[in-house]
Amino acid sequence: QDPYVKEAENLKKYFNAGDPDVADNGTLFLDILRNWKEESDRKIMQSQIVSFYFKLFKNFKDDQRIQKSVETIKEDINVKFFNSNKKKRDDFEKLTNYSVTDSNVQRKAVHELIQVMAELSPAAKIGKRKRSQMFRGRRASQ
Amino acid sequence: QDPYVKEAENLKKYFNAGDPDVADNGTLFLDILRNWKEESDRKIMQSQIVSFYFKLFKNFKDDQRIQKSVETIKEDINVKFFNSNKKKRDDFEKLTNYSVTDSNVQRKAVHELIQVMAELSPAAKIGKRKRSQMFRGRRASQ
């Protein structure tokens, strides 16, 4: 059994998340994840889910009762989602930490917009073989 | 030329984002995007970047001077990033709109954590061929 399971159960107790009423009104994440089979689509959704959990954990980082559980789970996310790749995790964290109300950040974001947009679709990537693979993947996932 | 280019130039004027000093202290997004060649890694990063732009646009949605530009750019993101798939965009929006401080949302998130974690790594998906492809891809992108 993965170590995160025991720690997630500990979090459940802390948040009273094992109560039957928690399942009322559908799921937050699970139904959405079931909708997307193609890996690139799943990453789009999981990226948002992981950033949600990181924000949640940040809000409770000073609570000693769950600190070990939170650290264990974060470590497991780093292994599973970021392939133990610190640079990937650091780049992700940078993106999640930008303040959308900071005028300097706003100006930079708008300055970079055209180039960001040009790279958004898989077909925009260079390399004919890669591009044709992408295109097949996109069609299959739609 | 894609229609978003003209509208992005309009946003640049509005935010004074064409000034030379905007490039000071590095980029927000472009250097990070250059780091990641593998499509699934790019989607992880682009997911955060797109949600940043959507939040930014939301903050300025009532400003008539840039409303048309914002709508055109959002439409182009929907085409390029979400493949014109409304369900994909709707699921993404749901995820970005969850409030991390809402106790009911917190409880649901913790309740779902074990299942979310179990699906985080590509290897968790069924299919030996798919899994081995993923692993090759993952190594190449680290």
Partner: antibody, heavy 123, light 111 residues
Framework: EVQLLESGGGLVQPGGSLRLSCAAS????????MSWVRQAPGKGLEWVSA????????YYADSVKGRFTISRDNSKNTLYLQMNSLRAEDTAVYYC????????????????WGQGTLVTVSS | NFMLTQPHSVSESPGKTVTISCTRS????????VQWYQQRPGSSPTTVIY?????PSGVPDRFSGSIDSSSNSASLTISGLKTEDEADYYC??????????FGGGTKLTVL
């Protein structure tokens, strides 16, 4: 109340042309993607063509590509379908339909539908 | 392109429940919204379910829509059948490549 009223159908010989119109009222026409859907006699529904709210993007079924042209005049709240090189298999009731979801630039579903106009291609 | 396959016809008695299936031939049924239209004889189609499971105002809650990823199909369920429900029913989805697909239609007979 949203209303869509098609016109322009009729009998035409193979190889001939027709122009269908759809007059829209009861909603902000330019905010919605619009479509044409057809139904051959006794058969099912077949999507034919779609156009974004601005008119900047158009989409066609493979069966009509290169022969049919969709357009719209937002100042007149009217949708058009120019049909050229008509074939016997184009015989159908043609429905004009509004996108059910506001502000999405390609239609995802169709609501409401007009009453339809019959196009008969026969010699 | 995928196809949406529906049974040609179904029949059931008034007051009973009937389910009409719509199976997607390739790609995931869950990855695009599914709609259901009712077409009574001599009339234009009207929406009874949109975006998988949403009911337009005016459509009774006897109509419900669902998605089943394991069978890669969508379903329209009508409970408490009435004679006025007798009609053709079509499922529809967007294929992601700027094409809109309809199922072949199912004729519902209320016995």
């Amino acid at each position: 109340e949203v209303q869509l009223l098609e016109s322009g159908g009729g009998l035409v010989q193979p190889g001939g042309s027709l122009r269908l119109s759809c007059a829209a009222s009861g909603f902000t026409f330019s905010s919605y993607a619009m479509s044409w859907v057809r139904q051959a006699p006794g058969k099912g529904l077949e999507w034919v063509s779609a156009i974004s709210g601005s008119g900047g993007s158009t989409y066609y079924a493979d069966s009509v590509k290169g022969r049919f042209t969709i357009s719209r005049d937002n100042s007149k709240n009217t949708l058009y379908l120019q049909m050229n090189s008509l074939r016997a298999e184009d015989t159908a009731v043609y429905y004009c339909a509004k996108d059910g979801s506001s502000g999405w630039y390609v239609p995802h579903w169709f609501d409401p539908w007009g009453q339809g106009t019959l196009v008969t291609v026969s010699s | 392109n995928f196809m949406l396959t529906q049974p040609h016809s179904v029949s059931e008695s008034p007051g009973k429940t009937v389910t009409i299936s719509c199976t997607r031939s390739s790609g995931s049924i869950a990855s695009n919204y599914v709609q259901w239209y009712q077409q009574r004889p001599g009339s234009s189609p009207t929406t009874v379910i949109y975006e998988d499971n949403q009911r337009p105002s005016g459509v009774p809650d006897r109509f419900s829509g669902s998605i089943d990823s394991s069978s890669n199909s969508a379903s329209l369920t009508i409970s408490g059948l009435k004679t006025e429900d007798e009609a053709d029913y079509y499922c529809q989805s967007y294929d992601g490549s700027n094409r809109w697909m309809f199922g072949g239609g199912t004729k519902l007979t209320v016995l």
